[in-house]
């Protein structure tokens, strides 16, 4: 991807960019491309939107191939129509404590975040808002059709759920880490971010990791068993190599992905871990990137894009990262 060779652009004409996205020259000054936006993957050839004060943060010098579009130090955040200064903490609602850092918002839930799966004593759990209370609570609905309960019970099991780490105090530092944000892509390779001060200087910093909730090419609905409405964590038949901007993971992974439902529910990562993955690029360069690996998924009706910004935020978090 070096810029010393002659400029040659794709055969098709310059792309039409979505509203609000700048058409810019790539990092070599060669071709017109749609600028990458905050939190998106960027490269020398795929630059970030300069009109929004974004730059491509490559992280450690060893990884100068692929970065994440990041706001310049001190960039404010716009959240729910309000502008917050970098470093400012605010309670976006009674449910969330948020922090703005260089254009990115990280939020910590103030309510419990467990995802409750059916169990023998509560086969139909449902979250409800109780009068006078901020946080929703779980209630157990009676089944509409008693006959369903009997034979199906053997399949129920309690799922371990992990909330945020309890607040830690270390050497005069109140350690706080927001949950990982939802993956920026519903399929294919995306980015997940969080804000933490869990470092030697107790300074807030943004962390990012690659994530893949499911491959785009997988036709998961075909795998749903007859009579079922969901496939929560489909089995991937063979180990796969991850691809990232033309670079390929050096190892193969038997990764877990989240499935799909046919009844309007969405399946999202429930428990995850973060592991380093080494990618080898066509020019022989090797780069190491942190990546989310799914342990379990949960299927629920609180799907991203619901009307309540906080509800969709709440359920689009990755709970219980073990890293």
């Amino acid at each position: 991807q070096n810029c010393s060779g002659p400029c040659r652009c794709p055969d098709e004409p310059a792309p039409r960019c979505p509203a609000g996205v700048s058409l810019v020259l790539d990092g070599c000054g060669c071709c017109r491309v749609c600028a990458k936006q905050l939190g998106e993957l960027c490269t020398e050839r795929d630059p970030c939107d300069p009109h929004k004060g974004l730059f491509c943060d490559f992280g450690s010098p060893a990884n100068r191939k692929i970065g994440v579009c990041t706001a310049k130090d001190g960039a404010p955040c716009i959240f729910g129509g309000t502008v917050y200064r970098s470093g400012e903490s605010f309670q976006s609602s009674c449910k969330y404590q948020c922090t703005c850092l260089d254009g990115a918002v990280g939020c910590m839930p103030l309510c419990s975040m467990d995802v409750r799966l059916p169990s023998p004593d509560c086969p139909f759990p449902r979250r409800v808002k109780l009068p006078g209370k901020c946080c929703e609570e779980w209630v157990c609905d009676e089944p509409k059709d008693q006959t369903v309960v009997g034979p199906a019970l053997a399949a129920y099991r309690l799922e371990d759920t992990f909330g945020p780490d309890p607040t830690m105090i270390r050497a005069n530092c109140l350690v706080q880490t927001t949950e990982w944000s939802a993956c920026s892509k519903t399929c294919g390779m995306g980015i997940s971010t969080r804000v933490t001060n869990d470092n030697a200087s107790c300074r807030l910093e943004k962390q990012s990791r690659l994530c893949m909730v499911r491959p785009c090419e997988a036709d998961l609905e075909e795998n749903i068993k007859k009579g079922k409405k969901c496939i929560r964590t489909p089995k991937i038949s063979k180990p796969i190599k991850f691809e990232l901007s033309g670079c390929t993971s050096m190892k193969t992974y038997r990764a877990k992905f989240c499935g799909v439902c046919t009844d309007g529910r969405c399946c999202t990562p429930h428990r995850t871990t973060t592991l380093p993955v080494e990618f080898k690029c066509p020019d022989g360069e090797v780069m190491k990137k942190n990546m989310m690996f799914i342990k379990t998924c949960a299927c629920h009706y609180n799907c991203p894009g619901d009307n309540d910004i906080f509800e969709s935020l709440y359920y689009r978090k990755m709970y219980g990262d073990m890293a």
């Epitope: 991807q1 070096n2 010393s4 060779g5 002659p6 400029c7 040659r8 652009c9 794709p10 055969d11 098709e12 004409p13 310059a14 020259l25 070599c28 000054g29 060669c30 071709c31 017109r32």
Partner: antibody, heavy 119, light 112 residues
């Protein structure tokens, strides 16, 4: 009709300067790279320089970099070649050409302007 | 620099016959994006050059189908299946994959 018209050529003494101009018409000028190619008398073609859509990137023949500069003015649909410290070996017909920047290079050529460097 | 060597330097062909011009590059001319930017230009007497073939084998718009390009790596060929009177002139191959961009020395096509 797509057209490129060069001007600014002429007789100049060694060490002198010339500025060649190329006026483009019949196409959206800012959607194309532009280039200069020269041809010495009785000789073959030689690429001189090209310039990207907005003039932020220019590439020149290494041996000419210190003396020649390519630039463009999209408002005037024009591309320029500033030639300084001219030498006898710079004597040639200078062609302005449109560079598609995609599949092909020089899909439209001007008629050329003659530069003669002689004392 | 990549040297483009054309053979023959001159060619005399009867009308209706086939003509073939070879162009060899001193090294591979595959661009870093994977494409090979090998082009052929014709300069008719007293005129500016005109594009015939780009990316080894793609015909430029308005170019008759009797012109065809082929080749890969370092060896490329321009063929004119049935030479017509208007085809006379000097043919140049050109590589645009590496700096400096370079032309072959030219092949003069004459009609017998």
């Amino acid at each position: 009709e797509v057209q490129l018209v060069e001007s600014g050529g002429g007789l100049v003494q060694p060490g002198g300067s010339l500025r060649l101009s190329c006026a483009a018409s019949g196409f959206t000028f800012s959607d194309y790279y532009m280039a200069w190619v020269r041809q010495a008398p009785g000789k073959g073609l030689e690429w001189v320089a090209n310039i990207n859509y907005e003039g932020s990137r220019t590439d020149l023949l290494a041996s000419l970099k210190s003396r020649f500069t390519i630039s463009r003015d999209n408002a005037k649909n024009s591309v320029y070649l500033q030639m300084n410290s001219l030498r006898a070996e710079d004597t040639a017909v200078y062609y302005c050409a449109r560079d598609t920047s995609r599949g092909s290079y020089f899909d439209v050529w001007g008629a050329g302007t003659t530069v003669t460097v002689s004392s | 620099d990549i040297v483009m060597t054309q053979t023959p330097l001159s060619l005399s062909v009867s009308l209706g016959d086939q003509a073939s011009i070879s162009c060899k590059s001193s090294q591979s001319i595959v661009h870093y994006n994977g494409n090979t930017y090998l082009e052929w230009y014709l300069q008719k007497p007293g005129q500016s050059p005109q594009l015939l073939i780009y990316k080894v084998s793609s015909r430029a718009s308005g170019v008759p189908d009797r012109f065809s390009g082929s080749g890969s790596g370092t060896d490329f060929t321009l063929k004119i299946s049935r030479v017509e009177a208007e085809d006379l002139g000097v043919y140049y191959c050109f590589q645009g994959s590496h700096f400096p961009l370079t032309f072959g020395q030219g092949t003069k096509l004459e009609i017998k």
